[in-house]
């Protein structure tokens, strides 16, 4: 015999108190699959969490973090402090990327600049704390007499010594 509850679609629940008829999920609750005997309570995005997507009868609310923070975890269960581009979050807080590394996002770690010479290329644009170097054509690609691209010396920013 087929379970009568299996006919209840998402957004409803199988109401045992009403001869197993399909009742709509009450306000602030949802069921994302059919055949459910209860609806789940909607997540509320409070405090540092803000609503990215409202709850509907068939899907839970989705949260993200207030400006200055970014999500961690499945479904944004925690918020972590942003840093600026050119920084990484360390145990001492946000710190500038060391010389020779960069971070172009407000989260994550500083990564080494691309080593253009490994690909036989030259440096077209120097790297910064916020941006990777841009590699140019390999010296062999430059025909004799063509304007050569001289790899500039790595520009050290004032007060930003190697660490």
């Amino acid at each position: 015999l087929q379970d009568p509850c299996s006919n209840c679609p998402a957004g409803t629940f199988c109401d045992n108190n009403r001869n197993q008829i399909c009742s709509p999920c009450p306000p602030n609750s949802f069921s994302s699959a059919g055949g459910q005997r209860t609806c789940d309570i909607c997540r509320q995005c409070k405090g540092v969490f803000r609503t990215r997507k409202e709850c509907s009868s068939t899907s839970n609310a989705e949260c993200d973090c207030t400006p200055g923070f970014h999500c961690l975890g499945a479904g944004c269960s925690m918020c972590e402090q942003d840093c600026k581009q050119g920084q990484e979050l360390t145990k001492k807080g946000c710190k500038d990327c060391c010389f020779g590394t960069f971070n172009d996002q407000k989260r994550g770690i500083c990564r080494p600049w691309t080593n253009c010479s490994l690909d036989g290329k030259s440096v077209l644009v120097n790297g910064t704390k916020e941006r990777d170097v841009v590699c140019g054509p390999s010296p062999a690609d430059l025909s004799p007499g063509a304007s050569s691209v001289t790899p500039p010396a790595p520009a050290r920013e004032p007060g930003h010594s190697p660490q």
């Epitope: 409070k46 405090g47 975890g73 269960s77 925690m78 918020c79 972590e80």
Partner: antibody, heavy 116, light 107 residues
Framework: QVQLVQSGAEVVKPGASVKLSCKAS????????MHWIRQAPGQGLGWIGA????????DYNQKFKDRATLTADTSISTAYMELSRLRSDDTAVYYC?????????WGQGTLVTVSS | DIQMTQSPSSLSASVGDRVTITCRAS??????LNWYQQKPGGAVKLLIY???RLHSGVPSRFSGSGSGTDYTLTISSLQPEDFATYFC?????????FGGGTKLEIR
């Protein structure tokens, strides 16, 4: 820097109420939920409840639902916890703490002693 | 409610020792696990959040790992200031719940 400063120690009689305060500084008070946690002498940590200062919305541990009331005054960046019908086993240190999905900053705690 | 079982409840160790504290949840908490340190004076500090992320200012001798229901706090080389009580806490569901604590004492 971010700081939570709690009110001073209280000695109260059984059956009475106590209202504790937690003053926040160094961040936007309304932007973070405030949670309250207690620790009885020699015991572990127990969650009482939380308040969203922006909306006044609260969540309570069922154990405290009938006796705890959480409020917040955003104009002075202060959260409050009132506990009524006090019993001797409510003797504990009460902490407020800011929530990011983890409790990153804690108040210094307020000792409440329930004694006749 | 999600139960958090922490072990051992107390532990004697010496400066320089490697120490491991474990925490088991009664259901999958999807890495939503945090660790706190409480000194005898009562002050509570966050050490690690989201299983393994070190909070600002916490020395790198502290580390966390785990998934599902089983989680671990490790102190790689104990320092005199590490003798304290440690608590785990889950943020997967309300009510937030804590482990019973591990008191780390000097041998």
């Amino acid at each position: 820097q971010v700081q939570l400063v709690q009110s001073g120690a209280e000695v109260v009689k059984p059956g009475a109420s106590v209202k504790l305060s937690c003053k926040a500084s160094g961040y936007t008070f309304a932007g973070f939920e405030m949670h309250w946690i207690r620790q009885a002498p020699g015991q572990g940590l127990g969650w009482i409840g939380a308040i969203d200062p922006k909306t006044g919305g609260t969540d309570y541990n069922q154990k405290f639902k009938d006796r705890a009331t959480l409020t917040a005054d955003t104009s002075i960046s202060t959260a409050y916890m009132e506990l009524s019908r006090l019993r001797s086993d409510d003797t504990a240190v009460y902490y407020c703490t800011r929530d990011l999905g983890y409790f990153d900053v804690w108040g210094q705690g307020t000792l409440v002693t329930v004694s006749s | 409610d999600i139960q958090m079982t922490q072990s051992p409840s107390s532990l004697s160790a010496s400066v320089g020792d490697r120490v491991t504290i474990t925490c088991r949840a009664s259901q999958d908490i999807r890495s939503n696990l945090n660790w706190y340190q409480q000194k005898p004076g009562g002050a509570v500090k966050l050490l690690i959040y989201y299983t393994s992320r070190l909070h600002s200012g916490v020395p790198s001798r502290f580390s966390g790992s785990g998934s599902g229901t089983d989680y671990t706090l490790t102190i790689s080389s104990l320092q005199p200031e590490d003798f304290a009580t440690y608590f785990c806490q889950q943020s997967e569901k309300l009510p937030r719940t804590f482990g019973g604590g591990t008191k780390l004492e000097i041998r």
